[in-house]
């Protein structure tokens, strides 16, 4: 790292090291030989999250309900607001600036991982012995019915989209 002229939490201005403003405060005026750096707290709905020399605080993020967003964590003077999505929706990016509806798993696919506010549904194909006959964001693949345990026989084989069809055993005459 290149050498710096000042201590940590200081900045160089007019050949002099001035104190940075602490998180939650903005710079009003630089220090002089006789005066300290002047800082002011950020206003309502504003924040600064680092030691800084910013003359304006940042606005808290707005969680727009029209985009399916809601407040997960209210911002403070030192932290931004954290948005998440309404139930049934998830963020389109890490910054969570908008939401999309959770994906449903088509027939033949089951839910491997249920969606959260920040991640979409993860689907997986139903393996042999399992099926899903609905389009759902919650349903896993279900195992085929075991005809044998019901003292029945398979009359129609199952697929990844349909259950087996059981029927009575043929009686020997």
């Amino acid at each position: 790292e290149p050498p710096t002229a000042c201590r940590e939490k200081q900045y160089l201005i007019n050949s002099q090291c001035c104190s940075l403003c602490q998180p939650g405060q903005k710079l009003v005026s630089d220090c002089t030989e006789f005066t300290e750096t002047e800082c002011l707290p950020c206003g309502e709905s504003e924040f600064l999250d680092t030691w800084n020399r910013e003359t304006h605080c940042h606005q808290h993020k707005y969680c727009d309900p029209n985009l399916g967003l809601r407040v997960q964590q209210k911002g403070t003077s030192e932290t931004d607001t954290i948005c998440t999505c309404e139930e049934g929706w998830h963020c389109t990016s890490e910054a969570c600036e908008s939401c999309v509806l959770h994906r449903s798993c088509s027939p033949g696919f089951g839910v491997k991982q249920i969606a959260t506010g920040v991640s979409d549904t993860i689907c997986e194909p139903c393996p042999v012995g399992f099926f899903s006959n609905v389009s759902s964001a919650f349903e896993k693949c279900h195992p085929w019915t075991s005809c044998e345990t019901k003292d029945l026989v398979v009359q129609q084989a199952g697929t990844n989209k349909t259950d087996v069809v059981c029927g009575p055993q043929d009686r020997l005459r």
């Epitope: 710096t4 002229a5 940590e8 050949s15 002099q16 090291c17 300290e36």
Partner: antibody
Framework: QVQLVQSGAEVKKPGASVKVSCKAS????????MHWVRQAPGQGLEWMGW????????NYAQKFQGRVTMTRDTSIPTAYMELNRLRSDDTAVYYC???????????????????WGQGTLVTVSS | DIQMTQSPSSVSASVGDRVTITCRAS??????LAWYQQKPGKAPNLLIY???TLQSGVPSRFSGSGSGTDFTLTISSLQPEDFATYYC?????????FGGGTKVEIK
């Protein structure tokens, strides 16, 4: 009372490395920057850099950039200065020195040294 | 880097004399200046900081003045224990820099 106790004298060959330690006692080690200053025989004082024992942050003089490493171990309040690729003109007494705690320092870096180690003589000779 | 120039490089004086050492910075450093005393084989000892503030335990015969680029260390009445080398140091910005030193010798 505040004390800075340094490791003993070292004799090194050109191209080698040396690591000098400085054990602090009598104050909160993480609360004050530690600086390293050297003095060649019969010469003046030369500032090498500082370490903030709290964050581990460092700042080295341009002259020593890439050759010096300052570290600390807060569990045994000790600061270290390692100098690599030693040359004969690195022969000097190396001092650790503590920042004067100036409560009202509002501008300037205000690094004055109120406590010094006893010094460690490093001799570089083939 | 800020250059610190001390003068004289040496001075011969007698006990009881008034001794003045000057230090000039290559650019303005406000009042961010310290003075140290160093005796042979010993670490430096802080005498004055912020140009004129006497460090705790330092005799009042030592005083400092100046701001900007020109600074002075004065020993009002030299004592036997004051024969030593004196250094100024700027504390305005890094890298910290020292003057070349002034050796106060017995006349």
């Amino acid at each position: 009372q505040v004390q800075l106790v340094q490791s003993g004298a070292e004799v090194k060959k050109p191209g080698a490395s040396v690591k000098v330690s400085c054990k602090a006692s009598g104050y909160t080690f993480t609360g004050k920057y530690m600086h390293w200053v050297r003095q060649a025989p019969g010469q003046g004082l030369e500032w090498m850099g500082w370490i903030n024992p709290d964050s581990g942050g460092t700042n080295y003089a341009q002259k020593f950039q890439g050759r010096v490493t300052m570290t600390r171990d807060t569990s045994i309040p000790t600061a270290y200065m390692e100098l690599n690729r030693l040359r004969s003109d690195d022969t000097a007494v190396y001092y650790c020195a503590r920042d004067q705690p100036l409560g009202y320092c509002t501008n300037g870096v205000c690094s004055y040294f109120d406590y010094w180690g006893q010094g460690t003589l490093v001799t570089v000779s083939s | 880097d800020i250059q610190m120039t001390q003068s004289p490089s040496s001075v011969s004086a007698s006990v009881g004399d008034r001794v003045t050492i000057t230090c000039r910075a290559s650019q303005g450093i406000y009042s961010w200046l310290a003075w140290y005393q160093q005796k042979p084989g010993k670490a430096p000892n802080l005498l004055i900081y912020t140009a004129s503030t006497l460090q705790s335990g330092v005799p009042s015969r030592f005083s400092g003045s100046g701001s900007g680029t020109d600074f002075t260390l004065t020993i009002s009445s030299l004592q036997p224990e004051d024969f030593a080398t004196y250094y100024c140091q700027q504390a305005n910005i890094f890298p910290l820099t020292f003057g070349g030193g002034t050796k106060v010798e017995i006349k």
